[in-house]
C-alpha cells in the first residue's frame, strides 16, 4: 500500500527564526527515514544533534528530531525529511521538505562575497541565477552591474526569489561582468559580488588512462577512467558505450577536479565485476558539450589463462658497436598477464653484474657499451602465480673500431728525424673487432714548402699505397704482419722496412674493420745534419783573420733560423741580433745559414747562438758556440834543432815545434835551399816535422826550420851527419 | 589628501606584454580591496582584475582571464596588472580604484594610464 508522506513539526513551505535562537523539528513517518539539510549544517559536528526514536501508537511510527543549537545565518536553506529505500519513481511522495531562514540584521545574505566576487558560470540564452539568497524573506535586494546598470526584476525575465536569489530566464552577453547585490538593513549598506565567465564548449584532451589494447583474465573486474580537460568555463556531459552495454553491466562514478587554476578536469570511471568473454571488445568514452564533441576508446580484451610467448625480434645473433650511448637487447614477447621479466649475461643476472644494465618491459637497456659486453643474453620470463616459465637465448657481438697502439703510447711532440741513408723499421699496432687489416701508404712532402710543415702543405698531394715491390719514396725492404698479444689482447702488428732513408715524407698506416677506419701519421723526415740541428766552426780566429760559422737544421722541423750574439750583463743574458746575414740555403734535408765576421777583432769574442723555431712546438732553440778571439803572437820554438849523427840508409825525424798566434807557418832549409816534399823526405802535420826515408849522403848538411806569423818569425838549425859509406850500385 | 598613480602603460605590438603599477597613498592600503578597471575608446568603463586586502585571492573578467594577473605589494602600497598575450581590443585607459566593485567615490581612483595595442 502506499506510504503516507513523512511529516514535519513545523508546518507550511517556509519559516523565520532569528539567529542565535535553536532549531527543534521534528520528522514522523511510517517508515525510516533520512535527513537532508543545507551544506553549512552537514559540516557542523557540535551545533547539531539527531535523535531517532519510536512513537505513535503502539510505538509503530517512526520520529527522527533534529536539534540544531545557535542557529546561524549561514544554515539558511532547505531542511528535508525522506523515506530511506524508496524506488526513485515514488521519490515525490515520499519526501517532506520546509526552507527555514534564519535571519540576522547583521548578515542579510546567506553568502557573503564582499571582497572577492564569486565566479558564476553562464550560457548565452540559458537561464542564469544570481545566488544572492537571503536570510529573510522580506529584505528588499537590488541588482546592479558595473559600472551603473541596475537589473530591474519584471516578473518574466529577472525574477527576484527570496530563497535562490536573481533569476534571469535567458542571459545575454549584458550579463556579462561584474554584478553585486545590494541590501540595505538598520540604514547598512551590504554588498555580495559576483562575476559572471561566459560558459565555454571547448573540449581540450579527453584520455583513457589505462594501456592500450586492456588485457584481463576471466573473472577479473575492469576498472576504466575516462579525464577530460576543459576551460574553466567548460561543463561536460561523459557516457560511455561498450559490448555488454544493453545488461547494463558497468557501473559508472563521475567526480570533477577544480584545483587546477587554468582547467577543470572531469572524471568518470567505469567498473565492470567478474569480466565474460562477452565484455570484450571497444570500450569508447565520449564527452560532449554543448555542440562540441570528442571520444577516445580503448580495446579489452579477455584471456581464459595465463601465457607466454617469446621469440627473437631479428636474428639470434645480434651486433653493436662499443662506444654506443646505449645499446637495447630485446625480445618479442607476448604475454598475459605481464610475466616477471629477468636478463641473465652469460648465465649471470645482468642487473648484478654492472649498474650499465637496465632492464625496461621486455629489453635489456645497454649503457656505454664496452669490449666486455659481448657474450650470451638469456631473457627469463615467469608468471609465477599461474605456474608460466619461458626463456630465449641471443648472443651479442660488440665490435670495436680499430685502435692504433703506437697512436696511443706515443708521447713525441714532433717528430723524429731519420739518419740519410738509414734502414729504418716502422710498427702500427692495431686492434679491433673483427680483426683489422692494415694497409701502408706514402705521401710525399712538397719540397717547394721549405717553410712549413710537410704535413699541413701537402694536403692536396696524392697518398701512394705501398706495398714490398712499390717504388714509391724510399726503397721497401719488406712489409709483413703477425699477430701479438699486448695488454693480453690478440693485436695484428704491420711492420714496414725501409731499406735505405732518402726521400722525406709521411708513411701512414691505416687499421680497418667494418665498424671504421683509423691512420697514424708517421713523419718521416730525413737528416743530414746530426740531431738535425748542428753548428760548425769552421776555425777558432786570431785577431785580424774571419769567423767562419755554419748553422744546419733539418728543413722540415725547423724555420726561422737566425744568428745571434749573446751577451752577459748585469746578470742578464741579452739577445744581440747580428746584422749582414746572408741568405739561407735550402738543399734537399736540410738549411744552412752561414756566418762570416770578416777581420775580428778581440771584441767579436763571445757566444754566438743559431736560434731556429721547431715548427711543432713552436720552441724556440739555441745551439750556442763559444769564440774567444785570440791575440797575434809572435812565433816562438818550444826546442830548438840540435845536431846529430845517423847511419846511412837508416831514417830520422827533425822536430820543430813552434806556438805563435796565429798559429806558424813552419819553413825547412837544408843549406839554406828551401825543402819541398819528395819522395823520401816527408813533411808532417803543420810541416813541424820533417823525415828522411833511407838517409844518403847528399842528406848530410845544414838544416833550418823558420816559424813564421803576422807578428814575425824564429829559426833553428843543426848539422846532420851521416855516417858510414854507401853502395852506390845498390842505388842503382 | 588620498592618491592613486598608475603608471606603466605605453604602445605594445600584439602578443606582447606590459605592467602596470599603481601606487596608493593617504588610506590604509592593506584594509582595502583593489580594482583595475578600464575604458576602451567609446565604450563603457568595464571591470577587468580584482584582488582582496591580504593580497591571496584574485579574479579576473572573462575577457582577460587566462592573459592578466593582478597582484599587490601591501608594504610599498602597489598595486599591479601584469597584462601578458595582449590583443587590439586590450587597449584602453587603465585606472586603479578602491574597493571590488570600485566606489562611486572618484576620489579613490586614480586618473589612468594609457595602454595601446597595435601593430
Known amino acids: 500500500s502506499k506510504l503516507k508522506d513523512p511529516e514535519l513539526s513545523l508546518k507550511g513551505t517556509q519559516h523565520i527564526m532569528q539567529a542565535g535562537q535553536t532549531l527543534h523539528l521534528q520528522c514522523r513517518g511510517e517508515a525510516a527515514h533520512k535527513w537532508s539539510l543545507p551544506e553549512m549544517v552537514s559540516k557542523e559536528s557540535e551545533r547539531l544533534s539527531i535523535t531517532k526514536s519510536a512513537c505513535g501508537r503502539n510505538g509503530k511510527q517512526f520520529c527522527s528530531t533534529l536539534t540544531l543549537n545557535t542557529a546561524q545565518a549561514n544554515h539558511t536553506g532547505f531542511y528535508s525529511c525522506k523515506y530511506l529505500a524508496v524506488p526513485t519513481s515514488k521519490k515525490k511522495e515520499t519526501e517532506s521538505a520546509i526552507y527555514i531562514f534564519i535571519s540576522d540584521t547583521g548578515r542579510p545574505f546567506v553568502e557573503m562575497y564582499s571582497e572577492i566576487p564569486e565566479i558564476i558560470h553562464m550560457t548565452e540564452g540559458r537561464e542564469l541565477v544570481i545566488p544572492c539568497r537571503v536570510t529573510s524573506p522580506n529584505i528588499t535586494v537590488t541588482l546592479k552591474k558595473f559600472p551603473l546598470d541596475t537589473l530591474i526584476p519584471d516578473g518574466k525575465r529577472i525574477i527576484w526569489d527570496s530563497r535562490k536569489g536573481f533569476i534571469i530566464s535567458n542571459a545575454t552577453y549584458k550579463e556579462i561582468g561584474l554584478l553585486t547585490c545590494e541590501a540595505t538593513v538598520n540604514g547598512h549598506l551590504y554588498k555580495t559580488n559576483y562575476l559572471t565567465h561566459r560558459q565555454t564548449n571547448t573540449i581540450i584532451d579527453v584520455q583513457i588512462s589505462t594501456p592500450r589494447p586492456v588485457k584481463l583474465l576471466r573473472g577479473h573486474t575492469l576498472v576504466l577512467n575516462c579525464t577530460a580537460t576543459t576551460p574553466l568555463n567548460t561543463r561536460v556531459q561523459m557516457t560511455w558505450s561498450y559490448p555488454d552495454e544493453k545488461n547494463k553491466r558497468a557501473s559508472v562514478r563521475r567526480r570533477i577536479d577544480q584545483s587546477n587554476s587554468h582547467a577543470n578536469i572531469f572524471y568518470s570511471v567505469l567498473t565492470i565485476d567478474k569480466m565474460q568473454n562477452k565484455d570484450k571488445g571497444l570500450y569508447t568514452c565520449r564527452v560532449r558539450s554543448g555542440p562540441s564533441f570528442k571520444s577516445v576508446n580503448t580495446s579489452v580484451h579477455i584471456y581464459d589463462k595465463a601465457f607466454i610467448t617469446v621469440k627473437h625480434r631479428k636474428q639470434q645473433v645480434l651486433e653493436t658497436v662499443a662506444g654506443k650511448r646505449s645499446y637495447r637487447l630485446s625480445m618479442k614477447v607476448k604475454a598475459f598477464p605481464s610475466p616477471e621479466v629477468v636478463w641473465l649475461k652469460d648465465g649471470l643476472p645482468a642487473t648484478e653484474k654492472s649498474a650499465r644494465y637496465l632492464t625496461r618491459g621486455y629489453s635489456l637497456i645497454i649503457k656505454d657499451v664496452t669490449e666486455e659486453d659481448a657474450g650470451n643474453y638469456t631473457i627469463l620470463l615467469s608468471i609465477k602465480q599461474s605456474n608460466v616459465f619461458k626463456n630465449l637465448t641471443a648472443t651479442l657481438i660488440v665490435n670495436v673500431k680499430p685502435q692504433i697502439y703506437e697512436k696511443a703510447v706515443s708521447s713525441f711532440p714532433d717528430p723524429a728525424l731519420y739518419p740519410l741513408g738509414s734502414r729504418q723499421i716502422l710498427t702500427c699496432t692495431a686492434y679491433g673487432i673483427p680483426q683489422p687489416t692494415i694497409k701502408w701508404f706514402w705521401h710525399p712532402c712538397n719540397h717547394n714548402h721549405s717553410e712549413a710543415r710537410c704535413d699541413f702543405c701537402s694536403n692536396n698531394e696524392e697518398s701512394f699505397i705501398l706495398d714490398a715491390d712499390s717504388n714509391m719514396g724510399n726503397r721497401i725492404e719488406s712489409i709483413t704482419q703477425r699477430m701479438a698479444i699486448i695488454e693480453g689482447k690478440n693485436k695484428m702488428a704491420s711492420t714496414l722496412v725501409v731499406a735505405d732513408s732518402r726521400i722525406s715524407g709521411i708513411y701512414i698506416c691505416i687499421a680497418s674493420n667494418k665498424v671504421g677506419t683509423v691512420g697514424r701519421n708517421i713523419s718521416f723526415y730525413i737528416t743530414d745534419v746530426p740531431n738535425g740541428f748542428h753548428v760548425n766552426l769552421e776555425k777558432m780566429p786570431t785577431e785580424g783573420e774571419d769567423l767562419k760559422l755554419s748553422c744546419t737544421v733539418n728543413k722540415f722541423l725547423y724555420r726561422d733560423v737566425t744568428w745571434i750574439l749573446l751577451r752577459t750583463v748585469n746578470n742578464r743574458t741579452m739577445h744581440y741580433s747580428i746584422s749582414k746575414q746572408k741568405m739561407a740555403i735550402t738543399k734537399e734535408h736540410s738549411i744552412t745559414l752561414n756566418l762570416t765576421i770578416m777581420n775580428v777583432s778581440l771584441q767579436d769574442s763571445g757566444t754566438y747562438a743559431c736560434r731556429a723555431r721547431n715548427v711543432y712546438t713552436g720552441e724556440e732553440i739555441l745551439q750556442k758556440k763559444e769564440i774567444t778571439i785570440r791575440d797575434q803572437e809572435a812565433p816562438y820554438l818550444l826546442r830548438n834543432l840540435s845536431d846529430h849523427t845517423v847511419a846511412i840508409s837508416s831514417s830520422t825525424t827533425l822536430d820543430c815545434h813552434a806556438n805563435g798566434v796565429p798559429e806558424p807557418q813552419i819553413t825547412w832549409f837544408k843549406n839554406n835551399h828551401k825543402i819541398q816534399q819528395e819522395p823520401g823526405i816527408i813533411l808532417g802535420p803543420g810541416s813541424s816535422t820533417l823525415f828522411i826515408e833511407r838517409v844518403t849522403e847528399e842528406d848530410e848538411g845544414v838544416y833550418h826550420c823558420k816559424a813564421t806569423n803576422q807578428k814575425g818569425s824564429v829559426e833553428s838549425s843543426a848539422y846532420l851527419t851521416v855516417q858510414g859509406t854507401s853502395d852506390k850500385s845498390n842505388l842503382e | 589628501e588620498v592618491q592613486l598613480v598608475e603608471s606603466g602603460g605605453g604602445l605594445v605590438q600584439p602578443g606582447g606584454s606590459l605592467r602596470l603599477s599603481c601606487a596608493a597613498s593617504?588610506?590604509?592600503?592593506?584594509?582595502?580591496?583593489m580594482s583595475w578597471v578600464r575604458q576602451a575608446p567609446g565604450k563603457e568603463l568595464e571591470w577587468v582584475s580584482g584582488?582582496?586586502?591580504?593580497?591571496?585571492?584574485?579574479v579576473n573578467a572573462d575577457s582577460v582571464k587566462g592573459r592578466f594577473t593582478v597582484s599587490r605589494d601591501n608594504a610599498k602600497n602597489t598595486l599591479y596588472l601584469q597584462m601578458n598575450s595582449l590583443k587590439p581590443e586590450d587597449t584602453a585607459l587603465y585606472y586603479c580604484?578602491?574597493?571590488?566593485?570600485?566606489?562611486?567615490?572618484?576620489?579613490?581612483w586614480g586618473q589612468g594610464t594609457q595602454v595601446t595595442v597595435s601593430s
Open positions: 580604484a578602491k574597493s571590488i566593485p570600485p566606489t562611486d567615490d572618484r576620489n579613490y
Open positions: 593617504g588610506f590604509t592600503f592593506s584594509s582595502y580591496a
Open positions: 584582488i582582496n586586502s591580504g593580497g591571496d585571492r584574485t
